[in-house]
Interface confidence: low
Amino acid sequence: ELCDDDPPEIPHATFKAMAYKEGTMLNCECKRGFRRIKSGSLYMLCTGNSSHSSWDNQCQCTSSATRNTTKQVTPQPEEQKERKTTEMQSPMQPVDQASLPGHCREPPPWENEATERIYHFVVGQMVYYQCVQGYRALHRGPAESVCKMTHGKTRWTQPQLICTGEMETSQFPGEEKPQASPEGRPESETSCLVTTTDFQIQTEMAATMETSIFTTEYQ
């Protein structure tokens, strides 16, 4: 089941998935001046069996001016600098993600891909948040969000993270304004069953990653 919405936006923060659940789609988009090759894939799809998950299809871009270039190579460092993504969609592998069954790793970049990756997440996906440079985190709980199915609808849990500027000294964790949860009430008050299949294993994995999640994003 695809999640209907994007993960929540937190001011001055970015989010990143450490691994992608089977069923996740990644659009094959090309940067300006390039296009998908004719008969090229529309998207990559995370698929797998009980022991191994991988991305089906490959994204390939070619110059809009030419018709025969179909090469697909990892960009050189100077090309990588063009990827000014706002959501840190970069191939980061801080831990061995083979330990998370039913998930795919971040796909490697393809030549001339668009500057931002758009994923279509599925229920059960977890993403992690970090404050952008120049802001520091005030935690009131996990800085993560999970796409859950509730009452037949998908929703993302609210990450408990506030990012404050380094110079701001007036706000302390005890002074934070409470943030409303998506349905306007605390999540503990929701009255229907929420499926939590593999959230626990992801949370445990997150704990081991805390210091290294966001260390290799493109500059």
Epitope: D5, E29, R36, E116, H120
Partner: nanobody
């Protein structure tokens, strides 16, 4: 579910301009590609223009290229179609469409590729 509501249609003289707007609500707007289609009286629905989620990719039908401009405002969940130098043959009901399929600049999108549609807004160009 995504809901789309068009506005801005009306009666205009040939050579005039109109700006159509499409307001999207529900579901994910930012990750969806958006398009405009039109249906003239007695004709099939035809592609007019489309814009990708990243605004990196804009496509136009040959008949409107250079006259129409598609744009989007992801912050406001809006898509626009600026129509200049209108001709009587531009008379039609204009529909806003959305989906999360990537756009391909080597293929003109078809109506079947888009899963979400507005009710349409009528544009009449008099000579």
């Amino acid at each position: 579910q995504v809901q789309l509501v068009e506005s801005g249609g009306g009666l205009v003289q040939a050579g005039g301009s109109l700006r159509l707007s499409c307001a999207a609500s529900g579901g994910t707007f930012r990750t969806r590609n958006m398009g405009w289609f039109r249906r003239a009286p007695g004709k099939e629905r035809e592609f007019v223009a489309a814009v990708s989620w990243s605004v990196d990719n804009k496509l136009y039908a040959g008949s409107v290229k250079g006259r129409f401009t598609i744009s989007r405002d992801n912050g406001r969940n809006m898509v626009y179609l600026q129509m200049n130098s209108l001709k009587p043959e531009d008379t039609a009901v204009y529909y806003c469409a959305a989906d999360n399929i990537p756009l391909s600049s080597d293929m003109r999108p078809t109506a079947t590729e888009f899963g979400y549609w507005g009710q349409g807004t009528r544009v009449t160009v008099s000579s």
